[in-house]
Structure formats: C-alpha cells, structure tokens
Amino acid sequence: QGWQAFKNDATEIIPGLREYPEPPQELENNQTMNRAENGGRPPHHPYDTKDVSEYSCRELHYTRFVTDGPCRSAKPVTELVCSGQCGPARLLPNAIGRVKWWRPNGPDFRCIPDRYRAQRVQLLCPGGAAPRSRKVRLVASCKCKRLTRFHNQSELKDFGPETARPQKGRKPRPRARGAKANQAELENAY
C-alpha cells in the first residue's frame, strides 16, 4: 500500500492541505475557519487592555491522518491549527489576510494552542503486523499570548492574569468541569 509515502513525524497531509504547522495563507478545500468567539468591549487602546477576552486569533480546522512509524490511522482526525496574528477582535478581518493594526514598536502577540484534547486512534500497520491503539494529542482551542521583550525573546507570556482553575476544562465544552467516578466496575467495554 505504499506505506513509505507516510511521514514519520506523525502526520500525513491530506492532498489540498498545507503541511502542518505552517499556517495556511488562504482557506483551501476541506478547511473551514472558525473565528474565536471572544467578543468583549473593544479596548480603548490595543496595548492597554487587561482583558484577554478582547483579543482573538483564528482557529483553522485541519484534517489529516496520523502515523506512528509505518502505521497509519484508519481514519483521519480533525484538529485545530492556531493561525494568524492576534489583535482586538473587532479589528480582525473576516477572511484570512495580512492586516497590520499594530504599531511597529508594539508588543508581539502570538496565536498558540490553549487547550488540548485526547482522541483514541487505531493505527493499522503493514505486513500483517498487529494494529496499535494510541491517544493522540490534538489542539482543542487557541489563545493569544504575548512575547515578552524584557526577557528571553522566545518566552511567551499569557496576556492577562490566570486564576486557579479547580475544574479546568481543556475541551471545548462548558468550563465547569465535572468529576466522574471510576467506571472500571461498570463496564467491560472491550
């Protein structure tokens, strides 16, 4: 089946899609754009706001197969790619493009993964080898982070304070995070 065609870095690009993690310049087939619904009042000044909810970045849906060595997922998985500049939500364009709303000497914001989720994947292997089962880490949502110029150039800082999250929700679901009891005694799911 031409297993050699699959990449060794756990990605196989579906034709028509750019190679991850390079952010696409334009939407292509099999991609949809999902602007983060962050809303909020527009800031008085792009750099003065303390409310991270007033900043937004793009979440691109991205479909691909995953591989582990010579083994490939039976089905493609869909995840998000965090793309584009961060800016006040009211100033972000509706289509992906290069819009410079910031001053050249303004702070540098990056659109990066915020939360992750796990998805079970069955990997089919060539030559009659036993299939594998893995849990792949996928991006669930994106957020804006600020590049700190006072420290290491590569150091990313959260924009705005983070508080304790007793029930953190890393999936795109209600933030209230429940707790469920051990289900081992309830099921023989296999």
Epitope: A10, D68, D114, R115, Y116, R117, A118, Q119, R120, A130, P131, R132, S133, R134, K135, V136, R137, Q167, K168, G169, R170, K171, R173, R177, G178, A179, K180, N182, Q183, A184, E187, N188, A189, Y190
Partner: antibody, heavy 121, light 109 residues
Framework: EVQLVQSGAEVKKPGASVKVSCKVS????????IHWVRQAPGKGLEWMGG????????IYAQKFQGRVTMTEDTSTDTAYMELSSLRSEDTAVYYC??????????????WGQGTLVTVSS | QAVVTQEPSLTVSPGGTVTLTCGSS?????????PYWFQQKPGQAPRTLIS???DKHSWTPARFSGSLLGGKAALTLSGAQPEDEAEYYC?????????FGGGTKLTVL
C-alpha cells in the same frame, strides 16, 4: 523535560484533611494531565484519580469519591490533591505523575518524589 | 471495580528470560486498555518501562519488551541483570479510569 516537585511530609490526626502540592516545571500545567497515585507502606500502587483529556474531566477512583479533590492553579503551575476525613489506612506516600507532553498521550511518564502522609492520633 | 491480577512473585536466573503477565477481571486485556508497565525499587518512585502495550521509553533497557499474550498484557525480560530485581506493576486504562495490578516481586537469583 517535565519535572515534578511535591510538598513535604505531613502528620495528621484522624478526621483531618491534608493537601499535597505538586509543582510542575519544564512545561505549563495546562499542557499536561496530572494523576495522583498512593502507596501504603509495604503495599502496592493505587490510582486515586486524575485528568482525562479525552472528555475534559477529572476522574476519581470510586474508592475515594467524595473524599478527594484534585485542583490546579495554572498561575503557579501547581496541582493539588486534598484528601479529607483521614483515617489510619490513609497513611501512605502520595505521588503525582504526569504525561510527557508528547504527540501521543502517554500518562504516568514523570513522577514526583512522593509525599509521606502519616495519619496518627 | 475491575481487578487487575499479576503473579505475586517470580524468580529468574541472571541472563535468563522471564515473562510477567497482567490480567483483567472484566475479560481479555486488549490494546484498548493501553497497558503500562512500571518498575519500582525500594525507596524510589515508580519508573515507566512500557506504555500502550509495547511502546518503550528512551530510558527503557532493550531487554524489556511489552506485548499481549493469551488475553493478558505481558512484560518479557530477556537477559535478566541483577539490577532488574524490583517490583513490577502493570496498569490498565478503563476508559480514563486506571487500575494498578498488585505487583510482581521479581528476584534475580
């Protein structure tokens, strides 16, 4: 490289509560899935609970349901495990463990040094 | 609650081969239980040897390997060394909940 540093040993009286902390470095807490495991003296490992990234919930072992609370403070990259209504059988070393933040979720890859909790009247 | 069973103790000669097994009270262990194997020496925290049935880690000696055998997860040690004497635990994933086995005390004698 993920590193986990836990709080120091505790001595508690029966009926009291204990809160053990687990400080993460090398990655941010929001990138990881923290689980808690305990080991009574001379006994085996026992899973208490942890974050399941598949459905975005903290799952507690049935045995500890209602007595244990696992929380996280992302501003300090510190995870906490609080166990209430302590009894002598809760005397154990408590470990936090996490995945390696790799492309594949592989849990329990990195372990804290353990926190000895002694419950004695 | 599911019960995960291991041999309480096993002995292997230096250079010999031994297989530790891990069974589930709910039925056959499959790849969807993502079996883990840990090594623990006295006074130390556990150390992961195998994840997801057969996936070794950078620190896992090549003489250790994981597999499924006869409806159980298995850890095979080929060419046992004195430093392999330790307690070995398996762990199974039941849909996000985990259960440890009781542990196998491996003696290299």
């Amino acid at each position: 490289e993920v590193q986990l540093v836990q709080s120091g040993a505790e001595v508690k009286k029966p009926g009291a509560s204990v809160k053990v902390s687990c400080k993460v470095s090398g990655y941010t807490l929001s990138e990881l899935s923290i689980h808690w495991v305990r080991q009574a003296p001379g006994k085996g490992l026992e899973w208490m609970g942890g974050f399941d990234p598949e459905d975005g919930e903290t799952i507690y072992a049935q045995k500890f349901q209602g007595r244990v609370t696992m929380t996280e403070d992302t501003s300090t990259d510190t995870a906490y495990m609080e166990l209430s209504s302590l009894r002598s059988e809760d005397t154990a070393v408590y470990y936090c463990a996490t995945d390696s933040a790799g492309y594949w979720y592989k849990f329990f890859q990195h372990w804290g040094q353990g926190t000895l909790v002694t419950v004695s009247s | 609650q599911a019960v995960v069973t291991q041999e309480p103790s096993l002995t292997v000669s230096p250079g010999g081969t031994v297989t530790l097994t891990c069974g589930s009270s709910t039925g056959a262990v499959t790849i969807d239980h993502y079996p883990y194997w840990f090594q623990q020496k006295p006074g130390q925290a556990p150390r992961t040897l195998i994840s997801d049935t057969d996936d070794k880690h950078s620190w896992t000696p090549a003489r250790f390997s994981g597999s499924l055998l006869g409806g159980k997860a298995a850890l095979t040690l080929s060419g046992a060394q004195p430093e392999d004497e330790a307690e070995y635990y398996c762990l199974l994933d039941y849909g996000g909940s985990f259960v440890f086995g009781g542990g196998t005390k491996l003696t290299v004698l």
